[in-house]
């Protein structure tokens, strides 16, 4: 377990001709806040699968108002860092997106309250416990500098949050096979639960399951006596044949390398693999420029004659990222409906349908309420060929299984107030607005409308109304 | 984002009926709560019938009973249906939506409906 936290340092206008024009003005005055959304590995993630390693919303940032004629300077930011709390291993590589969203403060007048200004989106390679990685990206005339990190949580070490620590239980060392927990230095690593039958004395684990041998020992469960002669290497894991490990640090302990490096181990020392726009030893220069080729996929490098300027690359069609990096994926719209699979043809989009469903993006449910089950007093509706449960008070969900508060999903617009009734839930609206869910003004250009909440906050934030 | 286009809009004679329909640019309506709004030259726009995400409908009182709303969940569309037209009728007639995922509302650009001998 552990933290993932993102510092925004600064949103503005990038370099290069066409600044963007203020999000804001005196007429209608705004703050910004952020949302970062995280998925595991570095492949796309699957559609429905979206934000799998977790989310996270900003505080709002304060108020601003565009002075007239003035360029649209950095923006003001909110205070303090989003986090994102990992339950399990963090997995070292990640997918991560982050929006810039700005709040509307004057009347609102049809129109949205919530308007999203940006969105950068990248992928990384990370170890827990190394230090601030920093990062610039561009989404148009935009750019979004930050930096992130990703901790493990106590008791939890290394850089998967994988091993756990616990106090020592002697003063001076700890037990067969465990180290030191850096930089916990006077707690020691907890065993982890191993193979079954993997030997408490000779044997020990990093990773639930496994078994791996001190020195001296061999075979699946670290009971077979080796010669010491047999070791080929001074450092490294056991393994049947050699059953060599020397504990203690390895070059790659605490992660060397920068700014999101990549560590691996070579025979004399470490070596790191570094994300582009950084360079050296531990990937702790920066500045890139038109010379280095950083636009990819035919990009187009405009500026950064020296390493102090920035560089901008034009994208061919079909391709977007700061460095012409990504495929533009229209997929990440989630066109595809009931789980179906999407796929980026190029020339077209395709849904590929799970069992069950079918038509251009799988809107069509094939069954019918005939062979349908809602569960807890929910009854079958069709309509359209799809079909769907609706669900008694206080369950929800596809089949009705789940328990649900009618008001947990902020079922009433516009400010309206949820009441749980024994029939059902009821919106009261505020004046000006009609609808089940008053979801209606009666006359929108005159309507002083509460903003709806965005993407991300939970039901009950204090924050979902101004 | 969601885009609304309107159709069905022109003169007809008092008494007479109309369809409007409204093509909504997503995969299901399912996700929209739907109206028709219009504005008269040199009034307010109103309300003049919605209907829900769940199906049930509201209507402005000087159309009860004359005008119905409904939707084809299938085609992703919404229809107005008009009937015994009158002169005080005649307005731009505007699609609305009101999403349920992004929060937001959006608008049609409108169609003209005139009611006139």
């Known amino acids: 377990a552990g933290v993932f936290e993102l510092q925004i340092h600064s949103f503005g206008p990038g370099p290069g001709p066409g600044a963007p024009r203020s999000p804001c003005s005196a007429r209608l005055p705004c703050r910004l806040f952020f949302r970062v959304c995280l998925k595991p590995g570095l492949s796309e993630e699957a559609a429905e699968s979206p934000c799998a390693l977790g989310a996270a919303l900003s505080a709002r940032g304060p108020v601003y108002t565009e002075q007239p004629g003035a360029p649209a300077p950095d923006l003001p930011l909110p205070d303090g860092l989003l986090q994102v709390p990992f339950r399990d291993a963090w997995p070292g590589t990640f997918s991560f997106i982050i929006e810039t969203w700005r709040e509307e403060l004057g009347d609102q007048i049809g129109g949205p309250a919530w308007s999203l200004l940006a969105r950068v989106a990248g992928r990384r390679r990370l170890a827990a416990g190394g230090p601030w990685a920093r990062d610039i990206q561009r989404a148009g005339a935009w750019e979004l500098r930050f930096s992130y990190r990703a901790r493990c949580e106590p008791p939890a070490v290394g850089t998967a949050c994988t091993r756990l620590c616990r106090p020592r239980s002697a003063p001076s060392r700890c037990g067969p096979g465990l180290r030191p927990c850096a930089p916990l230095e006077d707690e020691c690593e907890a065993p982890l639960v191993c193979r079954a039958g993997c030997s408490p004395e000779h044997g020990f684990c990093e990773q639930p399951g496994e078994c791996r041998c001190l020195e001296g020992w061999t075979g699946p469960l670290c009971t077979v006596p080796v010669s010491t002669s047999s070791c080929l290497s001074p450092r490294g894991p056991s393994s049947a044949t050699t059953g060599c490990l020397v504990p203690g640090p390895g070059p790659c302990d605490g992660n060397p390398c920068a700014n999101g490096g990549s560590c691996s181990e070579t025979p004399r020392s470490f070596e790191c693999t570094c994300p582009r726009g950084f360079y050296g030893l531990r990937c702790e220069v920066s500045g890139v420029t038109c010379a280095d080729g950083p636009c990819f996929n035919g990009g187009l490098c405009v500026g950064g004659a020296d390493p102090d300027s920035a560089y901008i690359c034009h994208c061919p069609p079909g391709f977007q990222g700061s460095n012409c990096e990504k495929r533009v994926d229209r997929c990440s719209l989630q066109p595809c409906r009931n789980g179906g699979l999407c796929l980026d043809l190029g020339h077209a989009l395709r849904c590929r349908c799970r069992a069950g469903f079918a038509g251009p993006r799988c809107e069509h449910d094939l069954d019918d309420c005939a062979g349908r089950a809602c569960a807890n007093g929910g009854t079958c509706v069709e309509g359209g060929g799809a079909h769907r449960c609706s669900c008694a008070l206080g369950f929800g969900g596809r089949d009705c299984r789940e328990r649900a508060d009618p008001c947990a999903a902020r079922p009433c617009a516009h400010g309206g107030r949820c009441y749980a009734h024994f029939s059902g839930l009821v919106c009261a609206c505020a004046p000006g607005y009609m609808g089940a869910r008053c979801e209606f003004p009666v006359h929108p250009d005159g309507a002083s409308a509460l903003p709806a909440a965005p993407p991300g906050l939970r039901p009950g934030d204090p924050q979902r109304y101004l | 984002e969601v885009q609304l286009v309107e159709s069905g809009g022109g003169l007809v004679q008092p008494g007479g009926s109309l369809t409007l329909s409204c093509a909504a640019s997503v995969y299901s309506v399912y996700d929209l709560s739907t109206a028709w709004y219009r504005q008269a030259p040199g009034k307010k726009r109103e309300l003049v019938a919605g209907?829900?995400?769940?199906?049930?409908?509201v209507y402005f009182d000087s159309v009860k009973g004359r005008f119905t709303i409904s939707r084809d969940n299938a085609k992703n569309s919404v229809y107005l249906q008009m009937n015994s037209l009158r002169a005080e009728d005649t307005a731009v007639y505007y699609c609305?939506?009101?999403?349920?995922?992004?929060?937001?509302?959006?608008w049609g650009q409108g169609t003209l409906v005139t009611v006139s001998s």
């Open positions: 209907i829900s995400d769940d199906g049930s409908t």
């Open positions: 609305y939506a009101y999403s349920w995922i992004t929060r937001s509302p959006y």
